[in-house]
Interface confidence: medium
């Protein structure tokens, strides 16, 4: 089977070759900026820092949204732009940085129910089921959309952050999306240095809690890019 670690909305709407051709299970994701692709058992990134073209917000990094680079510009040319911080103007939730949402045209601090999950709708299960069909290709799985009568506890499956109890968010964890804790000071966080790379993670972390931001750990400056740890630190 194709052991690609390709994930959800970030690839579901892309045409081949980015989305992978259905008839070619061996084809890796092509060399798009920051996209992870299978090279044997190593998942590599392509260091290309051009503006990342996009069609929707989900194709951009956590701290980005998809829009035309110029005001009133050609809607057909969209790239990933830096998210808007608190009290900045916005037109939709995705424009606001994690931990904020768009209210009355302004980015404001969010509660759990307004957290912009990175993958809110469906999950692409790209490992392929070990009891899958004969073609052995990766297949698509959608989580059941049952209503949650009680808020999900840590580790329980979820579709969106509003399914989770207070202090938790809904994030990808290997095979599914589960409720995970919002990160505290000193805890490891994920900083998406390469545009678009978050969409292909098989793991996600929640965002850092109030008053914290995800920054490189001071004693890891000498480490190689791939091994650098980021932690939630006070602003």
């Amino acid at each position: 089977t194709l052991n690609s670690v390709l994930n959800s909305n970030a690839i579901k709407n892309l045409p081949p070759p980015l989305g992978g051709a259905a008839g070619h299970p061996g084809s890796a994701v092509s060399a798009a900026p920051g996209i992870l692709y299978p090279g044997g058992n190593k998942y590599q990134t392509i260091d290309n820092y051009q503006p990342y073209p996009c069609a929707e917000d989900e194709e951009c990094g956590t701290d980005e949204y998809c829009a035309s680079p110029t005001r009133g510009g050609d809607a057909g040319v969209q790239i990933c732009l830096a998210c808007r911080k608190r009290r900045k103007r916005c037109m939709r939730h995705a424009m606001c940085c994690p931990g904020n949402y768009c209210k009355n045209g302004i980015c404001v601090s969010s509660d759990q129910n307004h957290f912009r999950g990175e993958i809110e709708e469906t999950i692409t299960e790209s490992f392929g089921n070990d009891h899958s069909t004969l073609d052995g290709y990766s297949r698509r799985t959608t989580l059941s959309s049952k209503m949650y009568h009680t808020k999900g506890q840590e580790g329980s499956v979820c579709l969106r952050s509003s399914d989770c109890a207070s202090g938790l968010c809904c994030a990808r964890h290997f095979w599914s999306k589960i409720c995970k804790p919002v990160l505290k000071e000193g805890q490891v966080c994920t900083k998406h240095r390469r545009k678009g790379s978050h969409g292909l993670e098989i793991f996600q972390r929640c965002y850092c809690g109030e008053g914290l931001s995800c920054r490189i750990q001071k004693d890891h400056h000498q480490a190689s890019n791939s091994s650098r740890l980021h932690t939630c630190q006070r602003h």
Epitope: N3, N41, T190, S227
Partner: antibody, heavy 116, light 111 residues
Amino acid sequence: QVQLVESGGGLVQPGGSLRLSCAASGFTFSSYWMSWVRQAPGKGLEWVSVISSDSSSTYYADSVKGRFTISRDNSKNTLYLQMNSLRAEDTAVYYCARHGIDFDHWGQGTLVTVSS
Amino acid sequence: DIALTQPASVSGSPGQSITISCTGTSSDLGGYNYVSWYQQHPGKAPKLMIYDVNNRPSGVSNRFSGSKSGNTASLTISGLQAEDEADYYCQSYASGNTKVVFGGGTKLTVL
């Protein structure tokens, strides 16, 4: 509190079959992925299989693929492991574990001995 | 067929600090910032002590801490106590067919 209780272990001959069960209580079983992990006598832990909360996805370690089948009955809060074509190297204590953020709760295990 | 490498044994005196290492490759431990540690007393089931590199589940003493650099993760136990004597296993994920990998285990002896 979360409780997982395995049963069904025992002595079986090589080539034989066995079905393990894991009764879950103290949490919403249908909302969690579940795994089986085994430990050969005096050895380390080895992941065996995992099943999604709604049974739509299953994964197996290469060492058991094609011989073991994981399943669950959410109405009975029970996880199963059907083990066929058993080999001597399958001898181990089999644990069921809740796979939340990693294996956050474990049962006490049931011993499976494959010997002639 | 153990994917992650741990020392077979470590020891320390009560009150001391000890560190257990866990080494993998870029295809498993080094590729993901997701490492867990489990404690197992003889005849008992394993217990999750650390997840996501350095997060402690509720109820786990803050004497236990985790870290990671490159392809190596570490579990540090400070203020060693007699009840810490147990086997410790690291666990990570892998990009190959074996999707969950454990270390071979480290026996901690409190002198």
